[in-house]
Interface confidence: medium
Amino acid sequence: EEELQVIQPEKSVSVAAGDSATLNCTVSSLIPVGPIQWFRGAGPGRELIYNLKEGHFPRVTAVSDPTKRNNMDFSIRISNITPADAGTYYCVKFRKGSPDVELKSGAGTELSVRAKPS
């Protein structure tokens, strides 16, 4: 059985303050069943950015329909970027359970925020 891969193709993305940022993430397999979550930062201090299953994430939208059968694209778009959004974002696959168990993280995409040109 091929090992699940979580692929974040861009190592870095640069966006002007006020614009939207797209962070790409795909998985190599639909198995095992379980959600994808996005975090900013790693370790215990990481910040939950997007969780399809529950919560309210008003500035974040899924690029593809994550509820569609056989969807393997879990890219997100973050709107109205500010300097405080800068950091490294990780796409993380969980195995469904009670609670869900973290399986694999993508390599991360560093988001840098440029001053908006005046």
Epitope: G18, P44, L48, G55, H56, P58, V60, P83
Partner: antibody, heavy 119, light 108 residues
């Protein structure tokens, strides 16, 4: 409906400790960063501390750093503020405030808990 | 650190008249500015976020404008229940989160 209810306030002497709690309901507590904001008598609002949704990331105002500790129990939907080495200038109403998203404004506030530090 | 300066400190307005409150940031905060209302003896309540968006349940007599460093909260037709202190809050740079010093709105 979102509800935030603080408890644990009271009167203490300088140098003593107190722990505030904030019971949250009506939203997905584990998905939101939470904050403590205080207001000294007759004064404006002062941000005190923030904790991220998972509980592992914390920030503090310089005025409380090293004395106050913010924590949360996502299984109990409760936010805490452990206040040590209290000073007279910590006297205030302490509000817990829900953050709209990880990098956002405070969209709901608790009713507040009064902490009085006096000898 | 971004400093928010609110003016005037106190505003006395007759019922039905317009009230205009100002909040100025020491550096740009984009559109990341909120306004909170605090009535005497009560907790703050969110009125406006992202400079111009009214929070849920807020009457349309409240409106926000501005971006960058200069922001305005307007109460188009003041009601007696609008007597309160109004605070602006920036969330463009943090920590720390910063609030303005407040504007007290009194009914004439």
């Amino acid at each position: 409906d979102v509800q935030l209810v603080e408890s644990g306030g009271g009167v203490v002497r300088p140098g003593e400790s107190l722990r505030l709690s904030c019971a949250a309901s009506g939203f997905s507590f584990s998905s939101h960063a939470m904050n403590w904001v205080r207001q000294a008598p007759g004064e404006g609002l002062e941000w005190v501390s923030r904790i991220n949704s998972g509980g592992g990331g914390t920030d503090y105002a310089e005025s409380v750093k090293g004395r106050f500790t913010i924590s949360r129990d996502n299984s109990e939907n409760t936010l805490y503020l452990q206040m040590n080495s209290l000073r007279a200038e910590d006297t205030a109403v302490y509000y817990c405030a829900k953050q709209y998203d990880w990098n956002g404004f405070f969209d709901y506030w608790g009713l507040g808990a009064l902490v009085t530090v006096s000898s | 650190e971004t400093v928010l300066t609110q003016s005037p400190a106190t505003l006395s307005v007759s019922p039905g008249e317009r009230a205009t409150l100002s909040c100025r940031a020491s550096q740009t905060v984009g559109s990341k500015l909120a306004w909170h209302q605090q009535k005497p003896g009560q907790a703050p309540r969110l009125l406006i976020y992202d400079a111009t968006n009214r929070a849920t349940g807020i009457p349309d007599r409240f409106s926000g404008s501005g971006s960058g460093t200069d922001f305005t909260l307007t109460i188009s037709s003041l009601q007696t229940e609008d007597s309160a202190v109004y605070y602006c809050q920036q969330y463009y740079y943090w920590p720390p989160y910063r609030f303005g010093g407040g504007t007290k709105v009194e009914i004439k």
